[in-house]
Amino acid sequence: MAVTACQGLGFVVSLIGIAGIIAATCMDQWSTQDLYNNPVTAVFNYQGLWRSCVRESSGFTECRGYFTLLGLPAMLQAVRALMIVGIVLGAIGLLVSIFALKCIRIGSMEDSAKANMTLTSGIMFIVSGLCAIAGVSVFANMLVTNFWMSTANMYTGMGGMVQTVQTRYTFGAALFVGWVAGGLTLIGGVMMCIACRGLAPEETNYKAVSYHASGHSVAYKPGGFKASTGFGSNTKNKKIYDGGARTEDEVQSYPSKHDYV
């Protein structure tokens, strides 16, 4: 039960995280005009990964896409790449994890296969989250560097008379969305990996186990659930995993011990 809950929760947390990464990537407010200790402007500038926008005091907003590819800073390209890789890995991870969910039965898929898929999706989520966190952090670092550079020469004058006020940019909402979303995806991935351990069948193959029940001899052989005795209830019979194939009925009739952890 705890494994199913951990896996399900990991999936949901990762889903929210990846939705957040997608939202952050699409958002325009990666960097916003710094309003503190600046001349009060009648416009508000903000920039995203794909376009820059200006909101005028009237409320009129104008956005321009970055139509050049080669003319953009390498760091911006790197951030774009990290975010896209994060989204792609996350999307694939989500797809894999759907099939790996314990509560969803697909054909005669074994627990070991589900465990492997859970681990795969977990790793994908972890890498996806790390990509998003790295992307946002690189952009934030770029902003901090530019902020102090523009502060150092905030007023760059020609001959001292005419001044050009440099617009300083600070952290936009998308950065915080990205950090949180990346963190959630990472946590979801870790949860999936933890769930995988619970899903994985025990590796030990028992050669033979026999014990004497009162009046009856019941031998357990590797590969079977029980040796039929012709007597009614078999609720005391213990399933011995051997990694062998089982029928769908067996999967349904005999829940794994891990469901009751």
């Epitope: 009060v40 920039q47 820059s52 005091s57 009237s58 409320g59 009129f60 617009t167």
Partner: antibody, heavy 120, light 113 residues
Framework: EVQLVESGGGLVQPGGSLRLSCAAS????????IHWVRQAPGKGLEWVAY????????YYADTVKGRFTISRDNAKNSLYLQMNSLRAEDTAVYYC?????????????WGQGTTVTVSS | DIVMTQSPDSLAVSLGERATISCKSS????????????LAWYQQKPGQPPKLLIY???TRASGVPDRFSGSGSGTDFTLTISSLQAEDVAVYYC?????????FGQGTKLEIK
């Protein structure tokens, strides 16, 4: 047709108060920021104050800060300028002007103005 | 505050001739975010309120004749009337629309020679 009509001007003694009004019609008042601009006799234009669409952003000229208060009532399509502690240098024609939506913050429509005279 | 300086203070031009008014700002009115200039030109005829002629340094407001044109960028701007008409006699003001407090030039009085 866009119309802005100012009222409330008159003669007031120094230190006195006056409340100017600006009635708007012919456009959706709540969609636009509005400015007050004044012009002293024989002088140039001087921007006084600005209020945004939803009154969330308000700016004043340094010369009137702390003495003048701009406000608006979108339900009544009206703009106000409460002027306290009036001085002789506040004598001017006061215009209300609409901040254009896509005119790079320029004022696209102006009222005819109302005259304020501060004198003892 | 941004200081707007117009020149000349007054100008006399013959009908049909070109009139040029200059405006300089103490700081650049070019917004880095969209590479647009936030400068407007107004015309004020005697006894009337100002009328918007040009915004964004070069865009004519609706209903403004095409003989009026604006140019310039950053700190130096120009209003040009290509062929002066009698009805163009007025005072012309430039205005900073980028920084609060919004500031106007002192005005240029245009007359017919």
């Amino acid at each position: 047709e866009v119309q802005l009509v100012e009222s409330g001007g008159g003669l007031v003694q120094p230190g006195g108060s006056l409340r100017l009004s600006c009635a708007a019609s012919g456009f959706t008042f709540s969609d636009y920021g509005i400015h007050w601009v004044r012009q002293a006799p024989g002088k140039g234009l001087e921007w006084v104050a600005y209020i945004s669409r939803g009154s969330s952003t308000i700016y004043y000229a340094d010369t009137v800060k702390g003495r003048f208060t701009i406000s608006r009532d979108n339900a009544k399509n009206s703009l106000y300028l409460q002027m306290n502690s009036l001085r002789a240098e506040d004598t001017a024609v006061y215009y209300c002007a609409r901040g254009g939506y896509d005119t790079r913050n320029a004022m696209d429509y102006w009222g005819q103005g109302t005259t304020v005279t501060v004198s003892s | 505050d941004i200081v707007m300086t117009q020149s000349p203070d007054s100008l006399a031009v013959s009908l049909g001739e070109r009139a040029t008014i200059s405006c300089k700002s103490s700081q650049s009115l070019l917004n880095s975010g969209n590479q647009k200039n936030y400068l407007a030109w107004y015309q004020q005829k005697p006894g009337q309120p100002p009328k918007l002629l040009i915004y964004g340094a070069s865009t004519r407001a609706s209903g403004v004749p095409d003989r009026f044109s604006g140019s310039g960028s950053g700190t130096d701007f120009t209003l040009t009337i290509s062929s002066l008409q009698a009805e163009d006699v007025a005072v012309y003001y430039c205005q900073n629309d980028l920084y609060y407090p919004l500031t106007f030039g002192q005005g240029t009085k245009l007359e017919i020679k």
